[in-house]
């Protein structure tokens, strides 16, 4: 009888230990949840406030109509310039109209003066045709003014208010372009 009581007491004690463990785990879990909740709320608030204050273009980008432009502060060859733009979720500048060309050249004059800036234009080695990087042809008024004498691949760049061509392996600044965010307000 005594043995039976002592076994029951041990079982009860074991149950109590298990419950204490469970309670400890629950408390720990609750604390972890609260911390995560705090982090999530902070992150959400952060996201919401940045979304609320968000301009159509990222910091250091210039807006014109539906586009955002980034004028680089470093030199690179054409292909590296393209890679740098893609990392920003953009592509090298694709000039669609005379109005856009005027905006770009006007902005460049204010920012940096007369330097060379790669754009997303390259010449097909076989056909000699100029194409934007998405495969479309530039409008007749937006063809590079001079044909480069380079035997290497030839790419387009902007200087002052002209579109020119050069060996793609030369070092220049570059301009990236992405779509501006539409305001949902």
């Amino acid at each position: 009888k005594l043995l039976q009581v002592s076994t029951i007491a041990m079982q009860q004690q074991e149950k109590l230990i298990q419950q204490e463990r469970a309670l400890l785990n629950f408390t720990e879990w609750k604390r972890s949840c609260a911390l995560q909740m705090k982090y999530c709320q902070a992150f959400m608030q952060n996201s919401l406030s940045s979304a609320h204050n968000s301009s159509p273009c990222p910091n250091n980008w210039i807006q014109n109509r539906e586009s955002c432009y980034y004028v680089s502060e470093i030199w690179s060859i054409w292909h590296t310039s393209q890679e740098n733009c893609l990392k920003e979720g953009s592509t090298l500048l694709q000039i669609e109209s005379k109005e856009e060309m005027d905006f770009i050249t006007g902005s460049l004059r204010k920012i940096k003066g007369s330097y060379d800036y790669w754009v997303g234009l390259s010449q097909d080695g076989h056909s000699g045709r100029w194409l934007w990087q998405d495969g479309s042809s530039p409008s007749p008024g937006l063809l590079p003014a001079e044909r480069s004498q380079s035997a290497n691949q030839v790419c387009g760049y902007v200087k002052s208010n002209s579109l020119l061509s050069s060996n793609c392996s030369t070092w220049k600044y570059f301009i990236c372009e992405k779509y501006a965010l539409r305001s949902s307000v």
């Epitope: 893609l86 920003e88 979720g89 998405d134 992405k178 779509y179």
Partner: nanobody, 121 residues
Framework: QVQLQESGGGLVQPGGSLRLSCAAS????????MGWYRQVPGKQRELVAA???????AYADSVKGRFTISRDSAKNTVYLQMNSLKSEDTDVYYC???????????????WGQGTQVTVSS
């Protein structure tokens, strides 16, 4: 960390077509662009085609008019439709994602294992 799973490579005759797919999975905050690169022996990987999160597209000169890149944003998947294939398109094609793992981290390049495309008669 971003994992990229490629599929669709294989052997095809000149003039034929192939469609490559690449699905991104894992934990990441944002993917700015996805695309396809090919490894030219003795050279760096070179861009074949890329598409940004805003839908802008860039192609290599050699594939313009023949290859088409597209994406399914909901599935984080990018496709490369390769038409009018030539023997010079034979290469290992690597999927690439330019992604940020967290909202604080910088954008890095993530690569797939590569899929072989062989154009031969």
């Amino acid at each position: 960390q971003v994992q990229l799973q490629e599929s669709g490579g294989g052997l095809v005759q000149p003039g034929g077509s192939l469609r490559l797919s690449c699905a991104a999975s894992g934990r990441f905050f944002r993917v700015n662009a996805m695309g396809w690169y090919r490894q030219v022996p003795g050279k760096q990987r070179e861009l074949v085609a890329a598409i940004t999160n805003g839908g802008q597209i860039a192609y290599a000169d050699s594939v313009k008019g023949r290859f088409t890149i597209s994406r399914d944003s909901a599935k984080n998947t990018v496709y490369l439709q390769m038409n009018s294939l030539k023997s010079e398109d034979t290469d290992v094609y690597y999927c690439n994602a330019k992604a940020a793992a967290t909202h604080l981290s910088t954008v890095a390049d993530y690569w797939g294992q590569g899929t072989q495309v062989t154009v031969s008669s």
